[in-house]
């Protein structure tokens, strides 16, 4: 079952013993069947895995990627999975741990020796066939090493949102990914009705900024529900 796959994973965050807000998220560590954490003047235990559902890699941590944990099982459930280290198999950049990228199906180091010249890509458009990658296309990419030293500005090529400066996210633009501005109040946003639909977007939008959510525009009355305009609105 999905649960048995998940329970082999690392601890996510420990909850506070008696409720209230925890501090910052804990880092992943190896887990025994249960983990002790302080609770008042005694110790309590928490199950050793907290699945974190996601729709896109950016919702996960920088050391994770978003995918279905089992092939063919629990359709529709995607969770954050631990990133893959060098020489492990991959289908896209986000699957590889920071400092690596996906080349010819293998995570390879993105150190300076590997990054010379501009972007070079091989695109295979494949929507829904057996060879399709997790985000709808495969690519071979060579990037300038400088993007790993400074945060990308708007328009810079990126692999993941953590490559971009504050206020920007890494989103698809044609067949590459570039840093784009996080959406502001009133800007049009994309609400994904079905799982995986964002994989078909050629011009992907960022998510809505802090305190905003993507909702149907109140004054936008149209007969078709699917064609209603969504904008970033205050909670």
């Amino acid at each position: 079952t999905l649960n048995s796959v998940l329970n082999s994973n690392a601890i996510k965050n420990l909850p506070p013993p008696l409720g209230g807000a925890a501090g910052h998220p804990g880092s992943a560590v190896s887990a025994a069947p249960g983990i002790l954490y302080p609770g008042g003047n005694k110790y309590q235990t928490i199950d050793n895995y907290q699945p974190y559902p996601c729709a896109e890699d950016e919702e996960c941590g920088t050391d994770e990627y978003c995918a279905s944990p089992t092939r063919g099982g629990d359709a529709g459930v995607q969770i954050c999975l631990a990133c893959r280290k060098r020489r492990k198999r991959c289908m896209r950049h986000a699957m590889c741990c920071p400092g690596n990228y996906c080349k010819n199906g293998i995570c390879v180091s993105s150190d300076q020796n590997h990054f010379r010249g501009e972007i070079e890509e091989t695109i295979t458009e494949s929507f829904g066939n057996d060879h399709s990658t997790l985000d709808g296309y495969s690519r071979r990419t060579t990037l300038s090493s400088k993007m790993y030293h400074t945060k990308g500005q708007e328009g810079s090529v990126c692999l993941r949102s953590s490559d971009c400066a504050s206020g920007l996210c890494c989103a698809r633009h044609f067949w590459s990914k570039i840093c784009k501005p996080v959406l502001k109040e009133g800007q049009v946003c994309t609400k994904h009705r079905r799982k995986g639909s964002h994989g078909l977007e050629i011009f992907q939008r960022c998510y809505c900024g802090e305190g905003l959510s993507c909702r149907i525009q109140k004054d936008h009355h149209q007969a078709s529900n699917s064609s209603r305009l969504h904008t970033c609105q205050r909670h």
Partner: nanobody, 125 residues
Framework: EVQLVESGGGLVQAGGSLRLSCVVS????????MGWFRQAPGRLREIVAA????????YYADSVKGRFTISRDDAKKTVYLQMNSLKSEDTAVYYC??????????????????WGQGTQVTVSS
Amino acid sequence: EVQLVESGGGLVQAGGSLRLSCVVSGGTFNVYAMGWFRQAPGRLREIVAAISRTGSSIYYADSVKGRFTISRDDAKKTVYLQMNSLKSEDTAVYYCAVDGRANGERPAVAGYNYWGQGTQVTVSS
């Protein structure tokens, strides 16, 4: 100060239903995943259900699949847990938890960093 307040718990007969709510207040951050956990006496605290930021990916523990439904309302910063066909083994304290992040913040490992105080659910057989 961030607060998560659960409500909707109580005593119900086996086969009955309850709807838990959890409201997030205070703090200026984006709410990413939201989840419900439970802890029965002498047991580990375990995940019941969780929902992604967009609501398009939902996880359920095997023990509650087909009986419980998680949903969220971002406008109200609220997460719900509809519990149907309740069994005596569902008796526990139910906690809600969320991942709250400042704009542009991305931790190394995503997880639930704000937790409620819990609400008791008791199912009598």
